[in-house]
């Protein structure tokens, strides 16, 4: 937590080495949270369409305890769409990102919760 999940039809072979690390570093910069709390999950090779086309696309989610809101989400979108375009060659207009502001009591970690 923060937790970023990317579902994409881009094949596994097209996901560059270091992509998970780069996502982690950039989310740490953007959220101000240490990398040890950031989880990323890239799910390639998915059967997907966006706008009726099977060109590269991504359906994503970012869960965080706080640090979610209008201006912040726009910043995250710029960052994450940029990374997906730069590294996976996915056009930003073929990306959806859902943002979830989690209650600390509803996030389990290390035998307990963050509450």
């Amino acid at each position: 937590m923060p937790m970023f999940i990317v579902n994409t039809n881009v094949p596994r072979a097209s996901v560059p080495d270091g992509f998970l690390s780069e996502l982690t570093q950039q989310l740490a910069q953007a959220t101000g949270k240490p990398p040890q709390y950031i989880a990323v999950h890239v799910v390639p090779d998915q059967l997907m369409a966006f706008g009726g086309s099977s060109e590269p696309c991504a359906l994503c989610s970012l869960h965080s305890i706080g640090k979610i809101g209008g201006a912040q989400n726009r910043s995250y979108s710029k960052l994450l769409c940029g990374l997906l375009a730069e590294r996976l060659r996915i056009s930003p207009d073929r990306v959806y990102i859902n943002y979830y502001d989690m209650n600390a009591a509803n996030v389990g970690w290390n035998n307990s919760t963050f509450a």
Partner: antibody, heavy 118, light 111 residues
Framework: QIQLVQSGPELKKPGETVKISCKAS????????MNWVSQPPGKGLEWMGW????????TYADDFKGRFAFSLDTSASTAYLTINNLKNEDTATYFC???????????WGQGTTLTVSA | NIVLTQSPASLALSLGQRATISCRTS??????????MHWYQQKPGQSPKLLIY???NLESGVPARFSGSGSRTDFTLTIDPVEADDAATYYC?????????FGGGTQLEIK
């Protein structure tokens, strides 16, 4: 080793513009945010805001919205602070500081002293 | 905005004594099982230097005489024992929320 080197002292008149540079070396510039901190003579530290070095997006503290602008030249690993329409009360030392993950400031520039006087 | 209140504003100690500086915040700076509170030392004419990050972690190269403690709204920087080189102003800073804010500073004089 990691270094942040700022441009030299500035003497300006009210109404003028100043651009202060902060050149980073020794680390991957785009992986860490860059902050700007002001310190008027004899006073404490005040966070002015930060710039995301990957997206180039600036965030300004309320007291520094309007005349202040952060920018980057990522190819030169350099961050800039521009202050327009200078006022006497802008007289201060301005520091750049790298955000480590967790937003603490682990490396600082040496500071740039700005004096605004007619 | 989160307000940080440092106390005392100044203190004068003899060599070998223990310095205790307090920083209280107007709301909790804890999240994700961490406290987003940090401490800096600034000497006249110099830039600030990071001492302690995330409340209790000693920055690399900082002597073990420095330690940090606390959580939520109450934090402490301790220097034990103080040395002549510790004469400086000390600032706390929170980064749990923007704007990132500093305390007003505590000036330490060594007698």
């Amino acid at each position: 080793q990691i270094q942040l080197v700022q441009s030299g002292p500035e003497l300006k008149k009210p109404g003028e513009t100043v651009k202060i540079s902060c050149k980073a070396s020794g680390y991957s510039f785009r992986n860490y945010g860059m902050n700007w901190v002001s310190q008027p003579p004899g006073k404490g530290l005040e966070w002015m805001g930060w710039i995301n070095t990957y997206t180039g997006e600036p965030t300004y503290a309320d007291d520094f919205k309007g005349r202040f602008a952060f920018s980057l030249d990522t190819s030169a690993s350099t961050a800039y602070l521009t202050i327009n329409n200078l006022k006497n009360e802008d007289t201060a030392t301005y520091f750049c500081a790298r955000s480590n993950y967790g937003n603490y400031f682990d490396y600082w520039g040496q500071g740039t002293t700005l004096t605004v006087s007619a | 905005n989160i307000v940080l209140t440092q106390s005392p504003a100044s203190l004068a100690l003899s060599l070998g004594q223990r310095a205790t500086i307090s920083c209280r915040t107007s709301e909790s700076v804890d999240s994700y099982a961490s406290s987003f509170m940090h401490w800096y030392q600034q000497k006249p004419g110099q830039s600030p230097k990071l001492l302690i990050y995330l409340a209790s972690n000693l920055e690399s190269g900082v002597p073990a005489r420095f330690s940090g403690s606390g959580s939520r709204t109450d934090f402490t920087l301790t220097i034990d024992p103080v040395e002549a080189d510790d004469a400086a102003t000390y600032y706390c800073q929170q980064s749990n929320e923007d704007p990132r804010t500093f305390g007003g500073g505590t000036q330490l004089e060594i007698k």
